[in-house]
Interface confidence: low
């Protein structure tokens, strides 16, 4: 029988900058029942506080509701593990809510094949931001990424959509059924999970010549350009 091993706070996430949750991994239990407590203080303060809510985030978590969440303030927190033989402490973790936002997936993904008579056909994709994100406040810039692939294909084709909530794609295989998903991230923060998927059947007459595969911004009303590998690499993951 030993004191507990050192715990580790391994993740903190916020869906919208208004609340956040942190999770820790217990160390070894020392063969005895172990109690965990998370304490924190805000940078510039000396007063220590205990975690306000150990329930909402599930096991080994601390949830900070609206009244406990301050933007632009760094939280300094640690976890204390205690059993009958003694205690151990995690390393201190510094958390700024601005940088831990992981939004919910975008909503209302809709995909349509558009075949205007006077223009080349294209796939039109649109979606809405996640409900919990209030873009009107100006606190958020959400960036979007689309992935699509033929149903049977292994590799995803990925497009970075910037701040747009709609997107047009021209170069697709006629007659194929495509799977489309979208995700989002704040300018500082983490990518959301991918949205629920939508399938779309590309008609067999969805054709274009090689010249048409070059998409100019002017051609599509400034809404889209195909991005380079360099752009894709730069935007791809936090």
């Amino acid at each position: 029988q030993l004191p507990p091993g050192k715990p580790e706070i391994f993740k903190c996430r916020s869906p919208n900058k208004e609340t956040f949750t942190c999770w820790w991994r217990p160390g070894t239990d020392g063969g005895l029942p172990t109690n965990y407590s998370l304490t924190y203080h805000r940078e510039g303060e000396t007063l220590m506080h205990e975690c306000p809510d150990y329930i909402t985030g599930g096991p080994n978590s601390c949830h900070f509701g609206k009244q406990y969440t301050s933007m632009w303030r760094t939280y300094i927190m640690m976890v204390n593990a205690t059993n009958q033989m003694g205690s151990s402490f995690s390393d201190e973790l510094y958390v700024d809510v601005t940088y831990i936002v992981q939004p919910d997936p975008p909503l209302e993904l809709a995909v349509e094949v558009k075949q205007p008579e006077d223009r080349k056909p294209y796939l039109w994709i649109k979606w809405s931001p996640p409900t919990l994100i209030d873009l009107k406040t100006g606190w958020f810039t959400l960036l979007y990424e689309i992935r699509l692939k033929p149903e049977k294909a292994a590799e995803w084709e990925i497009h970075f959509a910037g701040q747009q909530t709609e997107f047009k794609i021209l170069s697709l295989h006629p007659g194929q059924k495509y799977l489309v998903q979208v995700r989002c991230k704040p300018d500082h923060g983490y990518w959301s999970a991918w949205s629920p998927a939508t399938f779309i059947q590309i008609p067999s007459d969805f054709t274009m010549n090689d010249e048409q595969k070059l998409i100019s911004e002017e051609d599509l009303g400034g809404e889209q350009k195909l991005i380079s590998e360099e752009d894709l690499h730069h935007h791809h993951h936090h």
Partner: antibody
Framework: QVTLKESGPVLVKPTQTLSLTCTVS??????????VSWIRQPPGKALEWLAH???????SYSTSLKSRLTISKDTSKRQVVLTMTNMDPVDTATYYC??????????????WGQGTLVTVSS | DIQMTQSPSSLSASVGDRVTITCRAS??????LNWYQQKPGKAPKLLLY???SLQSGVPSRFSGSGSGTDFTLTISSLQPEDFASYYC?????????FGQGTKVEIK
């Protein structure tokens, strides 16, 4: 409270076009993440999803019926309309509209209308 | 499109029995699986969403589990009002599809 009510003809002749209206209350068709689905159920058979429309006007249709279906909404009238062309006796069914609820990681039909039985017969 | 296969198509059980209904998707649907109950002449009623989340007002004897392709609806102790048809429905990808239904009858 949330309610949905289907209305439309109870009898349609083969080859005619069916137009069904779903009138909603207790929520707005412009609320983010809200939508309305149409589902039908032939007598004694299983449920079949037909189409849905979201607050951002995103639409989706059943693969097998896509060429015959059109869904639209009038937010101010709180109505969603489904039209189905070239009706056939096999389209005889109870037609339901239901509210789509979009949760953090979930999409589900949480409120349903009572349904309207449409019979296709000459 | 994703196919949803429910089994059994019907079952007979007694009040107090534990009842299990399974639903299999033709491809992975994560946890985007909903369960509905329907009584004769009535509209379906949502029981569970996202595979295991109980809809508000639904008795706790109903539970759901599974992710990926295989899902289960369990009624821990069947009550007289539970005799009905049950449908699974995927909302992972459009077009959405329902299972063919399971009718729970009195033995």
């Amino acid at each position: 409270q949330v309610t949905l009510k289907e209305s439309g003809p109870v009898l349609v002749k083969p080859t005619q076009t069916l137009s069904l209206t779903c009138t909603v209350s207790g929520f707005s068709l412009s609320d983010a993440g809200m939508g309305v689905s149409w589902i039908r159920q032939p007598p004694g058979k299983a449920l079949e999803w037909l189409a849905h429309i979201f607050s951002n006007d995103g639409k989706s249709y059943s693969t097998s019926l896509k060429s015959r279906l059109t869904i639209s909404k009038d937010t101010s009238k709180r109505q969603v309309v489904l039209t189905m062309t070239n009706m056939d006796p096999v389209d005889t069914a109870t037609y339901y509209c239901a509210r789509i609820r979009t949760g953090t990681y979930s999409l589900y039909l949480d409120y349903w209308g009572q349904g309207t039985l449409v019979t296709v017969s000459s | 499109d994703i196919q949803m296969t429910q089994s059994p198509s019907s079952l007979s059980a007694s009040v107090g029995d534990r009842v299990t209904i399974t639903c299999r998707a033709s491809q992975s649907i994560n946890s985007y699986l909903n369960w509905y109950q329907q009584k004769p002449g009535k509209a379906p009623k949502l029981l569970l969403y996202f595979a295991s989340s109980l809809q508000s007002g639904v008795p706790s004897r109903f539970s759901g589990s599974g992710s990926g392709t295989d899902f289960t609806l369990t009624i821990s102790s069947l009550q007289p009002e539970d005799f009905a048809s049950y449908y699974c429905q995927e909302s992972y990808s459009t077009p959405w599809t329902f299972g063919q239904g399971t009718k729970v009858e009195i033995k």
